[in-house]
């Protein structure tokens, strides 16, 4: 007999990274007939909710309408069929952004270069602070963390044409609060490419989506995250 | 130590075309890119185009594309640039420097000049 | 492209004095901004990279700021030797572009 239910999708919209005091949703996603959804925050219980009618209702929200340091960090949820419980989600990291200061990202050797040429970039933030994120835009993306006591190199190596892209980073006070983010810097990478196995090694993590970051509270873009899987908040563990 | 060795002077027909070459020893030849800068007499630096070894890509200056091809010799650590369709204007002395990827043109060869001349 | 300009195009200076170069690109190339020594029938010779970080080798007498599009070259006290002719470059896109060079002779 079944002792539990398949555990439900946590995600956040429009994104988890949130602006500190702007608004983010937590969306739990279960199945028909559930009865109570629990949504809980570094291991204790935070918000519940009840759905109606519950046939015909699978997934519920918990607002959060002025996020801050308090509310960073790690929420799962899990739901109840009659007196039956769900195994819990995955972990949801949320990430407060725009805290403190704001982080200088430059490259090197320069922002245009030619496929196969070493590129280094460099993120600096002179507050305290000793973990770096890197993040490029786009749903096919790299997030790279770095360490420096006020500034950390992420080297890609060897570029190919797959690196081009506008690039941001954020100084990390913790897992969960990240400061301002830096002024983009584009990488143009021109050049054929003969040799293939100058592809990078591991091109991409489908989880950044930088662009719905931007987008947070204007327009309130939506993406399908039960694909996504959270693969850019395993990078926070 | 470093070192970019250039091919001698050469004197060619309008028209005609030049290769020169410049053999580097002393580093890893396919960890950085090399291009090629020209300076006519009298005159400032012109960027040529470059190249990198690891990959065999390039970017050219659009002034030149269609008449210049830079290529490598791996096996040899020797960067190649060739000029067709050769014009008085093209008289200048042609340096090849090393792009080092923390920072720019670090080191160069002594220079080639090259004169067109009917 | 990204025009460089450098003034002036000719400066006259005596051993020991202070020497500024200015350079101005086009539009803002942030610090991707280098500089250049060049002697006669020599090759250049990379100076400060990055508008005004030092090269190894380089006497501490150059020094370089600016960031955007206005960058400055200093040489506190000259020498003898610095008599040479000075060129910045664009190190932010391509084509990588040089600035017309500025002259530093004895008086």
């Known amino acids: 007999q079944q002792q539990t239910l398949p555990k439900p999708f946590i995600w956040a919209e429009p994104h988890f990274m949130v602006p500190k005091e702007k608004q983010v949703t937590i969306c739990c996603q279960g199945n028909y007939g559930a009865v109570e959804y629990q949504l809980h925050f570094e291991g204790s219980l935070f918000a519940v909710d009840r759905p109606k009618p519950p046939e015909r209702i699978n997934k519920v929200q918990f607002y959060i309408p002025d996020m801050n340091s308090r509310m960073a960090g790690q929420y799962s949820c899990i739901y109840r069929v009659g007196e039956l419980w769900s195994e819990p989600s995955n972990l949801l990291d949320l990430v407060v952004t725009e805290m403190y200061d704001t982080p200088t990202l430059s490259v090197h050797p320069g922002p245009e270069v030619i496929s196969g040429e070493k590129v280094t970039f460099y993120c600096r933030l002179d507050t305290a602070t000793s973990m770096f994120l890197l993040l490029k835009e786009g749903r096919s993306s790299h997030v790279q963390r770095g360490y420096g006591k006020v500034q950390a190199e992420f080297p890609l190596g060897p570029v190919t044409t797959a690196h081009r892209g506008t690039y941001r980073c954020f100084g990390s006070y913790n897992n969960h609060a990240w400061s301002f983010p830096s002024e983009p810097v584009k990488l143009l990478v021109t050049g054929d490419i003969e040799n293939t196995s100058l592809a990078p090694e591991d091109p991409t993590f489908p989880a950044d989506t930088w662009g719905t970051y931007l987008l947070t509270t204007e327009t309130g873009l939506q993406k399908d995250h039960a694909l996504w899987d959270h693969t850019a908040q395993n990078l926070l563990r | 130590e470093v070192q970019l060795q250039q091919s001698g002077a050469e004197v060619k027909k309008p028209g005609s075309s030049v290769k020169v070459s410049c053999k580097t020893s002393g580093y890893t030849f396919t960890e950085y890119s090399m291009h090629w800068v020209r300076q006519a007499p009298g005159k400032s630096l012109e960027w040529f185009g470059g190249?990198?070894?690891?990959?065999?890509?390039?970017s050219y200056n659009q002034k030149f594309k269609g008449r210049a091809t830079l290529t490598v010799d791996k096996s040899s650590s020797t960067a190649y640039m060739e000029l067709s369709s050769l014009r008085s204007e093209d008289t200048a002395v042609y340096y090849c420097?090393?792009?080092?990827?923390?920072?720019?043109?670090?080191?160069w060869g002594q220079g080639t000049t090259v004169t067109v001349s009917s | 492209d990204i025009v460089m300009t450098q003034s002036p195009a000719t400066l006259s200076l005596s051993p020991g004095e202070r020497a500024t170069l200015s350079c101005r690109a086009s539009?803002?190339?942030?610090?991707?901004l280098h500089w250049f020594q060049q002697k006669p029938h020599e090759s250049p010779r990379l100076l400060i990279k990055?508008?005004?970080q030092s090269i190894s080798g380089i006497p501490a007498r150059f020094s370089g700021s600016g960031s955007g599009s206005d960058f400055t070259l200093t040489i506190s006290s000259l020498e003898p030797e610095d008599f040479a002719v000075y060129y910045c470059q664009n190190g932010h896109s391509f084509p990588l572009t040089f600035g017309p060079g500025t002259k530093v002779d004895i008086k």
């Open positions: 990055y508008a005004s």
């Open positions: 539009q803002s190339i942030s610090d991707y």
């Open positions: 190249i990198s070894p690891n990959s065999g890509g390039t």
């Open positions: 420097a090393r792009r080092d990827f923390h920072s720019s043109f670090d080191y």
